[in-house]
């Protein structure tokens, strides 16, 4: 069996970066995207970015989402650009929390 | 072609710098990750570190980490190591290469010795 | 980190005879998404390495089909099924499942006797 592009490691996916960890990047690059949505004193805390290396992100990608926080990923060039993790508020909204985006 | 030529290499005294770089042509150099892989005399092949696509994310081998910098310019098809507090163990040809490894330069032989 | 083994260090074959090399890594270099990264390299005195194997059995373009790779998790094979001349050198196993971090095997040589 022949390829013309050999595969010696995993692909790496473009991923748009936003919150603390990005520092002045707007994007990185790495084997998993992702989009969270935690809460720290009252603040819905969103962030994005990416798993550089697969096991980092395997646990938290399979954890499903709690009250206090939610990480969707996904794998593909910048496929974490339109993606919103949601927490399980069930319709319901929890009172006194504001919506921050960390930068 | 695809074509890259390592330069910069030399003899170094112990705790010394030295900055390798990568001229790159023949294809996109900003559509693909670059590896810098080193060769120590007689021996086997050691992996020290890598760079994206853009100089987003970089990684070290434990080896070289803390001491040695991966940089690249897409504008100038360039890729470097910057190369501080030398050992002598770091005595090596290092070699530029494009993934998926298909394409390596020659290699540049740096010499750490008082 | 992933240690890769080769045995045998060296090979020392008859032109038209077969060789074969072996890698051994510490942990099973299978990825979660479902492709096993263990390439194997050749590397003529003087030279860079030259890219011959990927995903433990895909050649690569132009090289030559008497080159097979084989195995699954934690054993791995590379033969040449008549070694010919220009196939002296030192090979290498190279893992790259753990990506960004890559490990090579110490290589094994070839020679002919």
């Known amino acids: 069996m022949e390829d013309e592009k050999p595969k010696v490691n995993p692909k790496l996916y473009m991923c748009v970066c936003e919150g603390l960890s990005c520092g002045n990047e707007d994007h990185c690059e790495g084997q998993q995207c992702f989009s969270s949505l935690s809460i720290n004193d009252g603040f819905h805390v969103y962030q994005k970015g990416c798993f550089q290396v697969y096991e980092q992100g395997k646990m938290t990608c399979k954890t499903p989402p709690s009250p206090g926080q939610a990480v969707e990923c996904c794998q593909g060039d910048w496929c974490n650009r339109n993606i919103t993790a949601q927490l399980p508020t069930k319709g319901k909204s929890f009172p006194g929390t504001q919506n921050f985006h960390l930068e | 072609q695809v074509q890259l030529v390592e330069s910069g290499g030399g003899l170094v005294k112990p705790g010394g710098s030295l900055r390798l770089s990568c001229a790159a042509s023949?294809?996109?150099?900003?559509?693909?990750?670059m590896s810098w892989i080193r060769q120590a005399p007689g021996k086997g092949l050691e992996w020290i570190s890598f760079?994206?696509?853009?100089?987003?994310?970089?990684y070290y081998a434990d080896s070289v980490k803390g001491r040695f910098t991966i940089s690249r310019d897409n504008a100038k098809n360039s890729l470097n190591l910057q190369m501080s507090s030398l050992r002598a163990e770091d005595t090596a040809v290092y070699f530029c290469a494009r993934e998926p490894l298909q394409h390596w330069g020659q290699g540049t032989l740096v010499t750490v010795s008082s | 980190n992933v240690v890769l083994t080769q045995t045998p260090i060296s090979s020392p074959v008859i032109l038209g005879q077969p060789a074969s090399i072996s890698c051994r890594s510490s942990q099973s270099l299978v990825h979660s998404d479902g492709d096993t990264y263990l390439s194997w390299l050749h590397q003529r005195p003087g030279q860079p390495p030259r890219l011959l194997i990927y995903?433990?059995?895909n050649r690569v373009s132009g090289v030559p089909d008497r080159f097979s790779g084989s195995g699954a998790g934690t054993d791995f094979t590379l033969k040449i099924s008549r070694v010919e001349a220009e196939d002296v050198g030192v090979y290498y196993c190279m893992q790259g499942t753990q990506f960004p971090a890559l490990t090579f095997g110490g290589g094994t040589k070839v020679e002919i006797k």
């Open positions: 023949g294809f996109t150099f900003s559509d693909y990750y």
């Open positions: 760079i994206s696509r853009t100089g987003s994310t970089k």
């Open positions: 995903t433990v059995s």
